[in-house]
Interface confidence: medium
């Protein structure tokens, strides 16, 4: 049997059963999540669940830029350091940069400091690039 690889929306890229859209426009975390949802297909801000997934995403983004952080779908909605993925994925893989998690920083970004392989927490109202994800 021929197994066809699912296709992603134009401008999105495919990796291991998921489609990813990298958006180089400035949105705060909640607006970024709303915009991801607006693209349909059950899209949300991206969950990153393995080093392999992180590496693939990082390589793609580095082709565009290496200096600006990018919102992902990890947040701390209760503001109690109880982080969760907005798409409901299990919070098992972790890649925090080791910086302080204190203050009013309850949304996660891929940090440009380590080629987008590690995460930092930031204030959710900051306007940054963002990464969406859905399963086709």
């Amino acid at each position: 049997d021929i197994i066809m690889r699912p296709s992603c929306a134009p401008g999105w890229f495919y990796h291991k059963s998921n489609c990813y859209g990298y958006f180089r426009k400035l949105r705060n975390w909640s607006d970024a999540e709303l915009e991801c949802q607006s693209y349909g297909n059950g899209a949300h801000l991206a969950s990153i669940l393995s080093l392999k997934e992180a590496s693939t995403i990082a390589e793609y983004i580095s082709g565009y830029q290496r200096s600006q952080p990018i919102w992902i779908g990890l947040h701390d909605p209760q503001k109690r350091q109880q982080w969760q993925w907005i798409d409901g994925a299990m919070y098992l893989y972790r890649s925090w940069s080791g910086k302080s998690m204190g203050g009013n920083k309850h949304c996660a970004e891929m940090s440009s400091n380590n080629n987008f392989l590690t995460w930092s927490s930031n204030e959710c109202n900051k306007r940054q690039h963002f990464l969406c994800k859905y399963r086709p």
Partner: antibody, heavy 118, light 109 residues
Framework: QVQLVQSGAEVKKPGASVKISCKAS????????IHWVRQAPGQGLEWVGI????????NYAQKFQGRVTLTRDTSARTVYMEMNSLRPDDTAVYYC???????????WGKGTLVTVSS | FMLTQPHSVSGSPGKTVTISCTGS????????VQWYQQRPGSAPTTVIY?????PSGVPDRFSGSIDRSSNSASLTISGLKTEDEADYYC?????????FGGGTKLTVL
Amino acid sequence: QVQLVQSGAEVKKPGASVKISCKASGYTFNRYYIHWVRQAPGQGLEWVGIINPRGDSANYAQKFQGRVTLTRDTSARTVYMEMNSLRPDDTAVYYCAREGVGATWVHWGKGTLVTVSS
Amino acid sequence: FMLTQPHSVSGSPGKTVTISCTGSSGSIASNYVQWYQQRPGSAPTTVIYEDNQRPSGVPDRFSGSIDRSSNSASLTISGLKTEDEADYYCQSSDTMFQVFGGGTKLTVL
């Protein structure tokens, strides 16, 4: 359809203040950021600042920091730009422009001419 | 961060013109580029957003592209018409702040 209706022309003396408005219709007001851009006579476009209509938080171009204030009135679906300590070189058309999902800045107001002259 | 455009370009009806927009530092691909058309006495209108997307109502004679090797964006207008005569501005963002090019006057000969 989306419309941004701006207030009428203003003539001010140097040192005075001006407050102009941008009334939005045709969409959910608090969903989209509003930018302000100005254009001096015969010159190019210059970004002034941006406001989040959900909560008065605003950012300004460095040259306008401390002299421009962006505010909003949700019930009136209106965003305001106030500029203090006006100078003759502030004479310009001031435009508001709306960000959108996907498309950025597709919707613009028609502009408000502010003339600063003694 | 600055965006540099040629002061003016010209072309004959039916021909193709390209307007460039070069970034002064960093990568032009770091943030999306928009293009605005402004006819005399009118407000700007968006002809290209997010590098190469056209708002509805903008003819497909208008196209946008990014060239990372020259760190520049381009607006190409094919099948020139007299109504295309206008000023064209590129725009991008530098983290929180928005930046415009100086504008290019397109003359249709």
